[in-house]
Amino acid sequence: AITEAREEAKPYPLFPGPLPGSLQTDHTSLLSLPHTSGYQPALMFSPTQPGRPYTGNVAIPRVTSAGSKLLPPLAFKHTVGHIILSEHKDVKFNCSISVPNIYQDTTISWWKDGKELLGAHHAITQFYPDDEVTAIIASFSITSVQRSDNGSYICKMKINNEEIVSDPIYIEVQGLPHFTKQPESMNVTRNTAFNLTCQAVGPPEPVNIFWVQNSSRVNEQPEKSPSVLTVPGLTEMAVFSCEAHNDKGLTVSKGVQINIKAIPSPPTEVSIHNSTAHSILISWVPGFDGYSPFRNCSVQVKEVDPLSNGSVMIFNTSASPHMYQIKQLQALANYSIGVSCMNEIGWSAVSPWILASTTEGAPSVAPLNVTVFLNESRDNVDIRWMKPLTKRQAGELVGYRISHVWQSAGISKELLEEVGQNNSRAQISVQVHNATCTVRIAAVTKGGVGPFSDPVKIFIPAHGWVDHAPSSTPAPGNADPVLII
């Protein structure tokens, strides 16, 4: 049976018999009998429970160095077996043993739950020598005990390579319940059941759990820890906590918010970062996610033009990053742009619409009726064309780009010329004689360079040839342009 010493109990004696320093005669463990007697007990009796055989760890009797006498077995005296106290109290307990003086260099060590206690522990060993035996008291004290001090403490003594072990002293530190698992915040679907878990431990046990929702206790009857609360469903946000109580008091867990998933709020601050003739780069600030991660977003684009049919172009994109390049737009056009994002519950409303414009585009058609002829006297090539019929979206014509390629005996050289928008003719110097010159012309606006016209070739003869017939682009649908000599 365990001897219990509650904190309110009177201090227990260090020894069951007289104080150390005198021979112990009553409740003796026979260690104090003169070792010259040769008496060897077969059993050791517990001093706390006389008449019951003691089966603790004892040192086997052995012959002395003189070889003449037997020594009785050595064993620690019984002390209190179980100490129960509250957290933050102080505790002191001890082991005692009487050792015949024939033994030298006896040391006592303290062990807790199988591990030796070293270093910064308050352990004191006192020696009380007598004629034939020395009473040794090893005291262990803990100030302001904590739960971590709970455990089984024993003394060990080494004599002549033999180890003597005391009975365990169980220290039980009692306090308020301590949470090992607390409820966690969750985001849940409306009217859908979910579970919360709470677990707390003593000592003392049992620990009982009450659940609290929005400051109201949910269960009239406590549940033994651990407890799982099944909530059948919520229609609005709620705060849950659990209260754990034992015979020492009550501890409350952290309060956790259970949120109801909803559609996201609309994105805000849609911004234009870059516009080209056919694309617009936008960004946005996501709205509140409705307690559910964003899945994707939708960019909605409407052309702002009285003549347009008002249709909406929809571009789906990932929710992150919060940017999207809208492509396939018309040049020099006005658009209204909005963004909506979705989570598992549904789509948000559309963000406030913003206006954006594309820039001028490059011309989409080449100059017409390109004609090339040689003005041999001046060593020049004359080029003439007609202004292309560009759309408004291409913007204002700023000029033309002329590409002329000279090919002769395996050598090829391309040159580019720029001329103003008011011109419809140009002259270029002959670069090489006895060569072919291929001419293409493209219209240029602020939006860029349009497509080049079909190539027109003219042969530049060696010096002495005379032929001023022009070359020109054919009418639409004709074969490739030919050189007219």
Partner: antibody, heavy 114, light 109 residues
């Protein structure tokens, strides 16, 4: 639903002892500590003592020498015994759940008179 | 032993908010005093309203709330109703015993 019901003798002679039983239903005494409280006529409430789930007890220090609280968990009953009653022990005696004083019995009136 | 003090009587009107307080002679009331509020109605009917960590007992209307205000425990009734007319006792736990206040008689006119 948790319910507590007190039963007592009603009339006790001075210097005699009082025994009251609190019968608990809807909950096990192994998970509910029970306190005893009394209210003298026209006065406030006075806490008498508690019996813990593990069977330990704590008492009002002014009454400790005269009080004993015990329980029979198998019958779900808690017992209050008070010795050496005097006329100022006349009161209505209640048992109540402990950490939350939210479940009370209806009480039993005890009159100390010769 | 600690003495727990409450207002002896308070009067309020239906729909008004009223706060009852509970003071300890030993100093500030803390969470470890587990302030409990108990309502007494005629015919010895006691009902616990608030306990533990200022949580309402099951079935107690949300207009009753417990808190610690300054160095006192408080019971606030937000939007008092005529049926709230009663005597309200506060109880504080001191390590190993409860101490009850003298009670506050609340009248709802």
């Amino acid at each position: 639903q948790v319910q507590l019901k007190e039963s007592g003798p009603g009339l006790v002679a001075p210097s005699q002892s009082l025994s009251i039983t609190c019968t608990v239903s809807g909950i096990s005494l192994s998970s509910f500590a029970i306190s005893w409280v009394r209210q003298p006529p026209g006065k406030g409430l006075e806490w008498l003592g508690v019996i813990w789930t593990g069977g330990g007890t704590d008492y009002n220090s002014a009454l400790k020498s005269r009080l004993t609280i015990s329980k029979d968990t198998s019958k779900n009953q808690v017992f209050l015994k008070m010795n050496s009653l005097q006329t100022d022990d006349t009161a209505r005696y209640y048992c109540a759940s402990h950490w939350y004083l939210d479940v009370w019995g209806t009480g039993t009136t005890v009159t100390v008179s010769s | 032993q600690a003495v727990v003090t409450q207002e002896s009587a308070l009067t309020t009107s239906p729909g008004e908010t009223v706060t009852l307080t509970c003071r300890s002679s030993t100093g500030a009331v803390s969470t470890s005093n587990y302030a409990n509020w108990v309502q007494e109605k005629p015919d010895h009917l006691f009902t616990g309203l608030i306990g533990g960590a200022n949580s309402r007992a099951p079935g107690i209307p949300a207009r009753f709330s417990g808190s610690l205000i300054g160095d006192k425990a408080a019971l606030t009734i937000t939007g008092a109703q005529t049926e709230d007319e009663a005597i309200y006792f506060c109880a504080l736990w001191f390590s190993n015993h409860w101490v009850f206040g003298g009670g506050t008689k609340l009248t709802v006119l």
